[in-house]
């Protein structure tokens, strides 16, 4: 007995589509082997029509596809524009057509219901608008026009030109009679309901001279579009509901087990807490279309999603909807990375951001998720080097470690930095990820002075204390600019054995600027790293002033005043929106941090690493 299972019988009507789901045991071999849909011929051979390897027969070109969902042990064969010639016996299977793992499916395509001669067929999705055209002769121009719905043997009046409107169609139907010379009237029905489905009769005049025209209205619930995304990745639902609802509140909801639809997000400010920090409803275009981005996908995000429009911001019968079935693939190509990163006030965090390794040249970005209204994500930093002004000196995006991961470092942390941040690129949008920064109790591990004033032409020495736990790490000083943090040349630090016996409470690595020049003014970072993986950093601002007294200046390691709080984000910052997601260069322009000039270079700047005998304080 074959372990493949599906529908034994599928019946449909001409012009329709079918979506045949075949289930298989999701073993490793089954998940990755070829899937096929073939038609059994008189000879007993089964001729492939479509397969998971991309083959589509000429008979199916442009109207069929096969999608494998390995995670679920399911593959789906979609066939559109059915004709009666498609009736027959088929097999869905795994591997080779002639062997083993397959299931027999009988497909029957019928002509559909017999309709009166000359019946016009209107096929419209639920919630949309239909315009039924009703021709008439000149002699019936002055006479009553009406639309009836046929229910069984009776005809029920829906609307007429004497201002009658059936209560079932109240506020969503209108009859239009054109000016003289045009021998056609139209009936427009908005916000179609499933119950509107059926046969209608247009009538102009009465008695034996009346004009009649039949209309068959087919109201369909939209077939959900299959969406298959990776765990930890991102999905975008593009929702185009039409101009009729351009000014109506929009929503995305998820169908629950009670067959109702729970709002995930809407334009009235409602948002499901399960999506906090990882959802944006992008502003709608003039045509009323909008999109919803969800990042950090979880297995429990799977399900059927509907987007729609209604003044209440939630699903109501008879309003337009679009549907998706989201599957989340646990065999994800997106690597695991921490979803929560913790830092202490005054300290730092180094966030690893994954990107599609095939797109190493893509521009990298980091933005701050803001929950107000529909959510937005103003860009804070990008790989081209632009940094939001209020993050000057404390934020940097590094291409390291590379090969599918970049690093974002944020230091001088305050409680206001707690929140959700998104990693993204201008390439593969499915690789957007979310990280939450939490500020916890504690002291920074690296200790540097507060703000430092250096004297032009003299020597400046800045100490950076680190605890013993960092003794095996590489230490560095770098000069921050809006294009990154340029590592400063270090002096020979002596043999690494110096760090093996770590008895002292802390050690220090010093930065020496000799002589100090105007170009040395700016932010300097002391940091630790292991290979291409960055650890903690501490920042110090060096101001340069004219010479007042002679001699070298040594800055004591005592903690100086913290830098003042950053400015609040202004409303003009760029943010992710529909177009910009595809190409973040389309964001509105904004003020950027001016480049801080030449990097300190040559032998003027040096880094010295030694023990700090004179410093007795301990560091957590």
């Amino acid at each position: 007995k074959s372990p493949v299972f599906g529908p034994q019988e599928v019946s449909s009507v001409e012009g329709n589509s079918v979506s045949i789901k075949c289930y298989y045991p999701p073993t490793s071999v089954n998940r990755h082997t070829r899937k096929y849909w073939c038609r059994k011929g008189a000879s007993g051979r089964c001729i492939t029509l479509v397969s998971s390897e991309g083959y589509v027969s000429s008979n199916y070109a442009g109207r069929a596809n096969l999608t494998n969902f390995p995670e679920n042990g399911t593959f789906v064969v979609n066939i559109a524009q059915l004709s009666r010639d498609d009736s027959g016996h088929y097999k869905c299977g795994l591997g080779i057509n002639s062997r083993g793992l397959s299931f027999d499916v009988s497909l029957e395509v019928s002509q559909g219901p017999e309709l009166p001669n000359g019946t016009e067929v209107y096929t419209v999705d639920v919630g949309r608008t239909v315009t039924i055209k009703c021709p008439f002769k000149t002699e019936n121009a002055p006479k009553t026009k009406a639309l009836y719905k046929k229910i069984g043997q009776t005809s029920v009046l829906v609307i007429d030109s004497r201002n009658y409107v059936n209560p079932n169609y109240k506020d969503r139907i209108r009859l239009r009679i054109p000016g003289t010379g045009q021998l056609i009237f139209t009936v427009v029905i908005d916000r179609l309901r499933l119950s509107d489905h059926g046969l209608y009769l247009c009538q102009a005049g009465d008695g034996s001279n009346r004009d009649e025209k039949n209309a068959d209205l087919q109201v369909l619930e939209p077939e959900p579009e299959l969406v298959y995304e990776d765990l930890r990745g991102s999905v975008t639902f593009h929702c185009a509901l039409g101009l009729e609802v351009a000014n109506v509140a929009k929503f995305l909801c998820r169908v629950n087990s009670r067959e109702t639809c729970d709002v995930v997000i809407n334009t009235l400010g409602k948002r499901d807490s399960a999506f906090e920090g990882r959802i944006l409803l992008n502003p709608q275009d003039k045509d009323g279309s909008f999109s919803v981005v969800i990042t950090g996908l979880r297995k429990e995000d799977e399900g059927r999603y509907l987007c729609g429009a209604h003044s209440d911001g939630q699903l109501q019968e008879g309003w337009p909807i679009q549907a998706w079935q989201l599957f989340v693939n646990e065999e994800s190509t997106i690597p695991r990375s921490p979803t929560v990163v913790k830092g202490v006030a005054g300290g730092s965090v180094a966030v690893l951001c994954p990107y599609n390794p095939k797109e190493s040249q893509s521009l990298k970005y980091w933005c701050l998720w803001e929950g107000a209204q529909n959510g937005r994500c103003p860009l804070l930093v990008e790989s081209q080097g632009l940094v939001q002004e209020q993050y000057e000196g404390r934020l940097s995006l590094l291409q390291e470690p590379g090969n599918g991961t970049f690093t974002v470092i944020l230091n001088q942390l305050t409680t206001q930095d707690a929140g959700f941040y998104w990693c993204l690129t201008n390439g593969d949008t499915r690789w957007r990820t979310t990280v939450e920064i939490k500020i916890i109790e504690g002291e920074p591990n690296l200790k540097v002075p507060g703000n430092v004033t250096a004297v032009l032409g003299e020597t400046l020495n800045i100490p950076c204390h680190f605890p013993c736990k960092f003794s095996s790490y590489e230490k560095y000083w770098c000069k921050w600019s809006n294009t990154g943090c340029q590592t400063l040349p270090s002096q020979d630090e002596g043999p690494s054995e110096a760090f093996v016996n770590c008895d002292e409470n802390s050690r220090l690595v010093s930065l020496t600027l000799n002589p100090v020049t105007r170009a040395d003014e700016g932010w300097y970072w002391c940091g630790v790293k292991q290979g291409h993986f960055y650890g903690e950093t501490a920042a110090v601002y060096v101001a340069v002033e004219e010479k007042k007294v002679a001699g070298s200046r040594y800055v004591s390691p005592a903690k100086a005043d913290a830098a003042p709080d950053e400015k609040v984000l202004d409303s003009g910052v760029r943010e992710i929106e529909n177009k910009a997601i595809q190409d973040p260069r389309l964001f509105a322009e904004e003020k950027v941090v001016a480049d801080t000039g030449d990097q300190a270079g040559g032998s003027r700047a040096s880094v010295d690493s030694s023990s700090s005998e004179e410093q007795g304080g301990s560091s957590k």
Epitope: F5, P7, Q8, E9, V10, S11, S12, V13, N16, S17, V18, S19, I20, K21, Y23, N72, T74, G112, V126, L194, Q218, L220, E221, E223, P224, V255, S257, R258, E259, R304, Q325, F327
Partner: nanobody
Framework: EVQLVESGGGLVQSGGSLRLSCAAS????????VGWFRQAPGKEREFVTA??????????YYADSVKGRFTISRDNARNTVDLQMNSLKPEDSAVYYC?????????????????WGQGTLVTVSS
């Protein structure tokens, strides 16, 4: 929420026929799945058949043990799903349950149905 009520169970001789009905009340859908399951005393519940519809397309699923003997159908006017059981055997004796689900994707043989009926007893005597 959809409520489901089974009817039509009873005692029948081996080789005989029986027609079970599953009536749905509450909201009805253009896309829905109704499955029939059965549970004999001391045994696990097992899948019998299911019907899934989407607009004017219908998909019918049968367990190997009932294929060719049982037929599942949908009566739009009465809002019911009927199970015609022919050539009944003593091993078909069980409590028959109907179940409904919104999902168009999950395996109809599975147990992730959203609503279940109370069941109707079918006894086939030899």
């Amino acid at each position: 929420e959809v409520q489901l009520v089974e009817s039509g169970g009873g005692l029948v001789q081996s080789g005989g026929s029986l027609r079970l009905s599953c009536a749905a009340s509450g909201r009805t859908f253009d896309q829905f799945t109704v499955g029939w399951f059965r549970q004999a005393p001391g045994k696990e519940r097992e899948f019998v058949t299911a019907i899934r519809w989407s607009g004017s397309t219908t998909y019918r699923y049968y367990a190997d043990s009932v294929k060719g003997r049982f037929t599942i159908s949908r009566d739009n006017a009465r809002n019911t799903v009927d199970l015609q059981m022919n050539s009944l055997k003593p091993e078909d004796s069980a409590v028959y349950y109907c179940a409904g689900q919104m999902s168009q994707w999950s395996d109809p043989r599975g147990d992730d149905y959203d609503s279940w009926g109370q069941g109707t007893l079918v006894t086939v005597s030899s």
